[in-house]
């Protein structure tokens, strides 16, 4: 799988888009997980609504939201109030039974707010020495939680 890099600004929202074949993944729920090391397991962060027909409703886990355009074939993840510790490798997944297919690997890059002049020297970044291959950069601002969208409480 190729990896796509999305760049966002610390303190702002980052919107990640994972396109997929809507027919091939018809009826499947989706998930967003964080890769623990380059070859480690992928830890689930948030998944789409339990009812596939309601996948368009935004679900939250903490500051991360997910919504799925099942007709257009685009999974969208929003990382709100992006922080340095959010940087790293993630996956967009398609779920079937207990299995998960990788739709796309995503590398999130966090950059300084150009209007914030505080020294970032003491901030902690995971895996500073690591580098990941296959990248694409995108930056966008997400919309806020709309009426009727379902917040997803943090999991323990």
């Amino acid at each position: 799988h190729n990896t796509t890099v999305f760049q966002g600004v610390a303190g702002q929202s980052l919107q990640v888009s994972c396109p997929y074949d809507s027919m091939k993944h018809w009826g499947r729920r989706k998930a967003w997980c964080r890769q623990l090391g380059e070859k480690g397991p992928c830890q689930r962060v948030v998944s789409t609504h339990n009812l596939w027909l309601l996948s368009f409703l935004r679900r939250w886990n903490g500051s991360t939201a997910i919504t799925d355009d099942t007709l257009g074939g685009t999974l969208t993840i929003t990382l709100r109030n992006l922080q340095p510790h959010d940087a790293g490798l993630y996956q967009c997944q398609s779920l079937h039974g207990s299995e998960a297919d990788t739709l796309r690997k995503v590398l999130v890059e966090v950059l300084a707010d150009p209007l914030d002049h505080r020294d970032a020297g003491d901030l902690w970044f995971p895996g500073e020495s690591e580098s990941f291959e296959d990248a694409h950069v995108e930056h966008s601002i997400s919309r806020s939680l709309l009426e009727g969208e379902i917040p997803f409480p943090p999991t323990s």
């Epitope: 990896t3 760049q7 890059e109 950059l111 970032a120 500073e128 580098s131 694409h136 950069v137 995108e138």
Partner: antibody, heavy 118, light 107 residues
Framework: EVQLQQSGPELVKPGASVKMSCKAP????????MNWVKQKPGQGLEWIGY????????NYNEKFKDKATLTSDKSSSTAYMELRSLTSEDSAVYFC???????????WGQGTTLTVSS | DIQMTQSSSSFSVSLGDRVTITCKAS??????LAWYQQKPGNAPRLLIS???SLETGVPSRFSGSGSGKDYTLSITSLQTEDVATYSC?????????FGGGTKLEIK
């Protein structure tokens, strides 16, 4: 005004290493990825990789992973690229270029010419 | 790696001509495409990003179009200062790759 100022031309012997710099005044250095691009005489452009000056993380084209090391110094707003085990194939112009948020390398350095010759 | 193919490496044009340069990706790049202009001895200059967005300061005679795998750079009325090499670049997957370039020459 954004200006990327690259170090001067280099003439080095095969097998040696070289470290070139790209000074980036005029903007918030840690708010943009800094890329490096290779161009051999009369040929096209080749992406080497980028450095994130905020996190010090880097992302390399697999082809250059054993050839190039990208670093940066926030205090001087300078990005560096070290090339090792040089051969005549490494003779080229090397550009640094800033990634804009709208995709695309919006500001480029003037290029550093590297000549590898015995 | 995604291959970016510019079908013509060079072609002869006349001043005032409408010029169309094409770029084809080996897979869908979801409009993550930039166009650059480069003159001999100079660094490339970004003209268009996101396949269609004209950069600040770029003359309006330049435009970009396309989607999926196929993209086009158009110059409506070629001026002397437009004689250069034009390259496309994709951003969808790294290694970010460039087309081989298309050199415009005056007839």
């Amino acid at each position: 005004e954004v200006q990327l100022q690259q170090s001067g031309p280099e003439l080095v012997k095969p097998g040696a290493s070289v470290k070139m710099s790209c000074k980036a005044p005029g903007y918030s250095f840690t708010s943009y990825l800094m890329n490096w691009v290779k161009q051999k005489p009369g040929q096209g452009l080749e992406w080497i990789g980028y450095i994130n000056p905020y996190s010090a993380g880097s992302n390399y084209n697999e082809k250059f992973k054993d050839k190039a090391t990208l670093t940066s110094d926030k205090s001087s707003s300078t990005a560096y690229m070290e090339l090792r085990s040089l051969t005549s194939e490494d003779s080229a112009v090397y550009f640094c270029a800033r990634s804009s948020y709208r995709y695309g390398f919006d500001y480029w350095g003037q290029g550093t010419t590297l000549t590898v010759s015995s | 790696d995604i291959q970016m193919t510019q079908s013509s490496s060079s072609f002869s044009v006349s001043l005032g001509d409408r010029v169309t340069i094409t770029c084809k990706a080996s897979e869908d790049i979801y409009n993550r495409l930039a166009w650059y202009q480069q003159k001999p001895g100079n660094a490339p200059r970004l003209l268009i990003s996101g396949a269609t967005s004209l950069e600040t300061g770029v003359p309006s005679r330049f435009s970009g179009s396309g989607s999926g795998k196929d993209y086009t750079l158009s110059i409506t009325s070629l001026q002397t200062e437009d004689v250069a090499t034009y390259s496309c670049q994709q951003y969808w997957s790294t290694p970010w790759t460039f087309g081989g370039g298309t050199k415009l020459e005056i007839k």
